[in-house]
């Protein structure tokens, strides 16, 4: 946020940039949290726009019994590895076809034991406040589906009649990692020393990091005719004086008519 300065007073302004603001020859360049001619004002809203999508990664191991391990499978650039990868991916795409969050699989390692396939199942969902629940549910369905297929698609008399067959006991889920997105934490961090006064409110499922000085939210402070200003002790209303009235009170809701004061009478409305 920047405010341009013209005229002789500019040099004075340069040395007076506050809150880490820097003078660029014309104006104070303010850090994210501040604005105003001297960077003296604290913003009332901080952009913590969430990512469009949130990802999860499940580390799984399955044992494929319908393929015999050969040395070429250790080399990820070999034709054999590429073929195995293609067939395994096609098989897993079928297994997980009913899961909207499923993105694909990524083989990390093939090793001996028929073929032990260490791989990641990749999941992704649009960001909503419920993303954790959505991804938790998806990981449970992945577990169910891989358990089912590795129980059903098995070798009979050393022959597999499916695209791939598995060892029922060779299926393991090692680890589940969900991309962490915590708007409350981000909001607190970005608000720095004002973190106690900034909160996250949702509108159309989008999080907004706001202080009570931001109008239009449930936590918004109504300063009536005054101006809301953030300080280290919290939001405060700076009350105005008009030609006819002085305003006071925590929310500038007490108006005192000047003529009555000069006449030594107080009148509140």
């Amino acid at each position: 946020r920047t405010t341009t300065c013209f005229g002789d007073g500019c040099q004075n302004t340069a040395s007076r940039c506050k809150n880490g603001g820097t003078w660029d020859g014309l104006k104070c360049q303010c850090p994210n949290l501040y604005y105003g001619e001297l960077c003296e004002e604290v913003v009332s809203s901080i952009d913590i726009g969430p990512p469009e999508t949130i990802s999860a990664q499940m580390e799984l191991t399955v044992t494929v019994t319908s393929v015999k391990f050969t040395e070429e499978l250790k080399n990820h650039s070999s034709q054999e590895f590429q073929e195995f990868k293609q067939t395994f991916t096609e098989q897993m795409n079928i297994v997980y076809s009913g899961i909207p969050e499923y993105v694909g699989v990524n083989i990390t390692k093939l090793r001996l034991g028929s073929v032990v396939v260490e791989h990641d199942v990749l999941l992704r969902t649009k960001y909503t406040p419920e993303y954790k629940t959505v991804l938790d549910n998806a990981t449970e369905v992945v577990k169910e589906k891989i358990t089912k297929v590795t129980t059903q698609q098995i070798m009979i008399n050393d022959i597999c009649s499916d695209m791939m067959c598995f060892n029922t006991t060779g299926t393991q889920v090692q680890n589940i990692t969900v991309t962490q997105y915590d708007p409350e934490e981000d909001c607190r961090k970005m608000a720095k020393e004002y973190g106690d006064y900034f909160v996250v409110e949702y509108r159309d499922q989008k999080p907004y990091c706001i202080s009570p000085c931001e109008p239009g939210f449930s936590v918004s402070k109504n300063c009536n005719l005054g101006k809301c200003q953030m300080s280290l002790s919290g939001p405060q209303c700076l009350c105005v004086t008009t030609e006819t009235h002085w305003y006071s009170g925590e929310t500038c809701n007490q108006g005192t008519q000047k003529s009555l004061v000069y006449g030594h009478h107080h009148h509140h409305h």
């Epitope: 393929v67 015999k68 070429e72 054999e80 293609q86 499916d162």
Partner: nanobody, 123 residues
């Protein structure tokens, strides 16, 4: 680029014999799994015979004792000797290949296919 070209199909009387050949190129022939599949009109493609790099073979129940699969690694060729042919053997016969050592009779596991050769068994 992997290429498979079948030959040897034709019209034969019930009880007769045919020998199908498949010429392979574009990969290390001796390492993979080779197979013969067939598809009769209006039916699904089915596995007929399979041979691994170590010579291990397997056959569909319907052809056991009548068909023999073999390979000549020096010539990059696969063969299917078909004896005692029956009317129900009438189909397009396909040669299929995988670079992997497979133990599956499912067509989806084989990425490389020839164009097919027609075998008609009729009197």
């Amino acid at each position: 680029e992997v290429q498979l070209v079948e030959s040897g199909g034709g019209l034969v009387q019930p009880g007769g014999s045919l020998r199908l050949s498949c010429a392979a190129s574009g990969f290390t022939f001796s390492r993979g799994t080779m197979a013969w599949f067939r598809q009769a009109p209006g039916k699904e493609r089915e596995g007929v015979a399979f041979i691994n790099s170590d010579g291990r073979t397997s056959y569909a129940e319907s052809v056991k004792g009548r068909f023999t699969i073999s390979r000549d690694n020096a010539k990059n060729s696969l063969y299917l000797q078909m004896n005692s042919l029956r009317a129900e053997d009438t189909a397009v016969y396909y040669c299929a290949a995988s670079l992997l050592y497979l133990m599956t009779v499912n067509a989806a596991a084989y990425p490389y296919w020839g164009q097919g050769t027609m075998v008609t068994v009729s009197s």
